[in-house]
């Protein structure tokens, strides 16, 4: 073989006379005196098998040269590239009437690959070939030679193969190279879809629609299609494929993400480095595993760092005020890498004798602003029992606390409530009003906080505005206030006392004494 010759990727060579080892051995007619196989030397001193004829002396030349059978390989249109040298008749004195400067190209389709003779009538003419000005200068044996290149195409072809023939009509010519090829759109990958080798259509204007298949580790986004043009070029790519999760595009392929990288979705994005506190140990990771002690919340994206529960709140301070407690604390030293930190308060009521025997405080205790999901670092707890041991736990929580709850995430304080004064009296009533007296009655406070020792009634004339008031004390829950002025408005307040002291006065009760005796039941509103 004369050496490997490189042709465009979109051309498939069916015959290349330059690549044939030894003699070409094509069939000539007549057998002698017409086309002759001659070896010439190229610039590398390598023999080139050529066919030459130079019968310029006699008129009416009809010298035929036929190639061997050429398989079609499914091509419907083939191209014939002829490189030849044609001698100018002017350089051959005395032959002007008989010398020609053209030759004819023919073809014959056949399923028979062993036809031995040339039957001229079977052949169809492709074209008359003439030397034009588009020759190239080629070194042949140190001689600069004008090498013409002509390309013709023929189709549509339908039989298994065909023969080419060259008819000389009296030229001085050398066929230096005959190459027969068809065009294909070569296997290619576009938008991660692979399109197979596709032979071009029968017409020079035809487009062949080809559906692509997604490359390994990818999936269709839109159906990938392209058109194979007659010149062997792919046209109009439509649709595309995307690399699967765990894979990224590299040089038209979907490569698995490297260890330490991941890709969560089928997108055109590249693999990303595992987020902080996570890792992947296999290639092709779709997510990264959290390090020991680190977690992802359900709504955390795969791209977010793995986080952990917060450490315990710091600097918990309690302030007991009788049966209320105010708690304050500082944020944890370690928030676990999250912003969604909040605090929960756990209240436990513990026995005085055995602090380990604690039970939940129940629903009677109130928390301001709330017990759970606190965003602030303070809470006020009220309505506790007096003289009771309470343990309060402040839990720092975030989005991953539920995966690893631990006492390390809380801080606690134990307090004892003081003896508290009774609560205020809710309802004071005027049972009987006369010109000079008012009979009052009331209910025990909601929270006596101990044994009520007595009640204190404070009253004054409304016009005096508490500048001058009188006090009456009683152990009972009623009393008669005497010595009042007739037809005068009085304001009454009642409070209870225990060992811890007085509670708050009740809301004011306004009563006006009569001009004539009468019985009126007060409801806490003004009585006239």
């Amino acid at each position: 073989v004369t050496g490997s010759r490189v042709y465009p990727a979109n051309e498939v060579t069916l015959l290349d006379s330059r690549s044939v080892q030894g003699e070409l051995g094509w069939i000539a007619s007549p057998l002698e005196g017409g086309w002759e196989e001659v070896s010439i030397m190229d610039e590398k001193n390598t023999p080139i098998r050529t066919y030459q004829v130079c019968n310029v002396m006699e008129a009416s030349q009809n010298n035929w040269l036929r190639t061997d059978w050429i398989t079609r390989e499914g091509a419907q249109r083939v191209y014939i590239e002829i490189k030849f040298t044609l001698r100018d008749c002017n350089s051959l004195p005395g032959v002007m009437g008989t010398c020609k400067e053209t030759f004819n190209l023919y073809y014959y389709e056949s399923d028979n690959d062993k036809e031995r003779f040339i039957r001229e009538s079977q052949f169809g003419k492709i074209d008359t070939i003439a030397a034009d000005e588009s020759f190239t200068q080629v070194d042949i044996g140190d001689r600069i030679m004008k090498l013409n290149t002509e390309i013709r195409d023929v189709g549509p072809l339908s039989k298994k193969g065909f023969y080419l023939a060259f008819q000389d009509v009296g030229a001085c010519i050398a066929l230096v190279s005959v190459r027969v090829f068809y065009k294909k759109c070569p296997l290619t990958v576009r938008n991660l879809a692979q399109f197979p080798d596709t032979i071009t259509g029968a017409d020079t204007s035809s487009l062949v629609e080809v559906r692509g298949s997604c490359v390994n580790n990818s999936e269709e986004k839109d159906v990938p299609k392209m058109y194979c043009g007659a010149d062997g070029e792919w046209l109009v790519p439509i649709g595309n494929c995307l690399c699967n999760a765990g894979h990224e595009e590299q040089n038209g392929e979907c490569q698995a993400c490297k260890i330490g990288y991941y890709k969560a979705l089928s997108t055109d994005a590249s693999c990303a480095k595992c987020p902080p506190h996570s890792y992947s140990v296999w290639e092709g990771a779709t997510s990264c595993t959290c390090d020991r002690g680190f977690f992802r919340a359900d709504n955390d994206a795969a791209s977010m760092p793995c986080t952990r529960p917060p450490s315990a709140p710091l600097n918990l301070i309690s302030n007991v005020n009788e049966t209320s407690v105010n708690l304050e604390w500082s944020s944890p030293q370690n928030t676990g890498g999250r912003q969604d930190i909040s605090y929960n308060v756990v209240c436990k009521k513990c026995g005085a004798g055995d602090p380990s025997k604690c039970r939940p405080c129940g629903s009677g205790v109130h928390y301001t602003p709330q017990q759970n999901g606190l965003k602030t670092t303070r809470v006020s707890i009220t309505d506790l029992l007096a003289h009771t041991n309470y343990t309060f736990e402040i839990w720092a929580v975030n989005g991953v606390s539920k995966y690893n709850p631990s006492p390390d995430q809380s801080v606690s304080v134990t307090v004892t409530t003081n003896q508290a004064a009774p609560s205020s009296i809710a309802l004071v009533q005027a049972k009987e009003v006369t010109r000079y007296s008012v009979a009052l009655a009331w209910l025990e406070p909601d929270r006596p906080n101990g044994v009520i020792l007595e009640y204190e009634v404070k009253y004054y004339e409304k016009d005096q505005n508490e500048r001058s008031y009188r006090i009456v004390r009683t152990a009972a829950r009623n009393t008669d206030i005497k010595g009042l002025n007739p037809l005068t408005s009085y304001v009454f307040h009642v409070r209870a006392r225990t060992a811890a002291g007085y509670g708050d006065f009740s809301e004011p009760l306004e009563v006006t004494t009569n001009t004539v005796p009468s019985r009126i039941i007060g409801d806490g509103a003004n009585s006239t």
Epitope: G33, V38, I40, M41, Q52, C54, N55, V56, M57, E58, A59, T85, L86, R87, S91, L92, P93, G94, V95, G97, T98, I140, G141, D142, R143, I144, M145, C172, I173, A174
Partner: antibody, heavy 121, light 106 residues
Amino acid sequence: QVQLLQSGAEVKKPGASVKVPCKASGYTFTSRAMSWVRQAPGQGLEWMGWINTNTGNPTYAQGFTGRFVFSLDTSVSTAYLQISSLKAEDTAVYYCARVRFTVYGDGMDVWGQGTLVTVSS
Amino acid sequence: EIVLTQSPATLSVSPGERATLSCRASQSVSSNPAWYQQKPGQAPRLLIYGASTRATGIPDRFSASGSGTDFTLTISRVEPEDFAVYYCQQYGPSWTFGQGTKVEIK
């Protein structure tokens, strides 16, 4: 096989004429031009010219016009060289040679055995 | 008219040696000359013609090269039957021969 057959030696007096035949065989006579070459004793080759065997049209080299005539008889596939008014300096071996035209260059691929023409008084 | 000058006039070589014969044209020519071999008492024999093509039956120890005005015939390993006179010949509208180079036994 392809052959060119020339006649034997000729001895001529100055001023005389000679006609040297060259009979071709083994190929189509009219398909190839015929060339004539002179070689004086101890000298090199001199191309005299050639004749188109198809048309009979001759081409003469410089110095070989006038007294030298190329002719043909295609019926017997023979070419002739006729020299008139012979001179002593015409003494030489005269060769006929078949011309090979090719696209890359020409040459004389088949030669007759030569005819020695001696011009002597 | 193109004049061909051959050198050397005589080349002495031993059998098996390489022989290089030169042919120089008086002006640049577009093609290689033909080369002929002539032995005493024999007609010339065509060795090489257009594009350095060897004539039928010529062994491959004969090769020709060159371009422009300088051309060379090379006998790679001279055999005893190669001792002869060699002529170059330029073709065209007018053909001319060089004066010849004699290759003799050293």
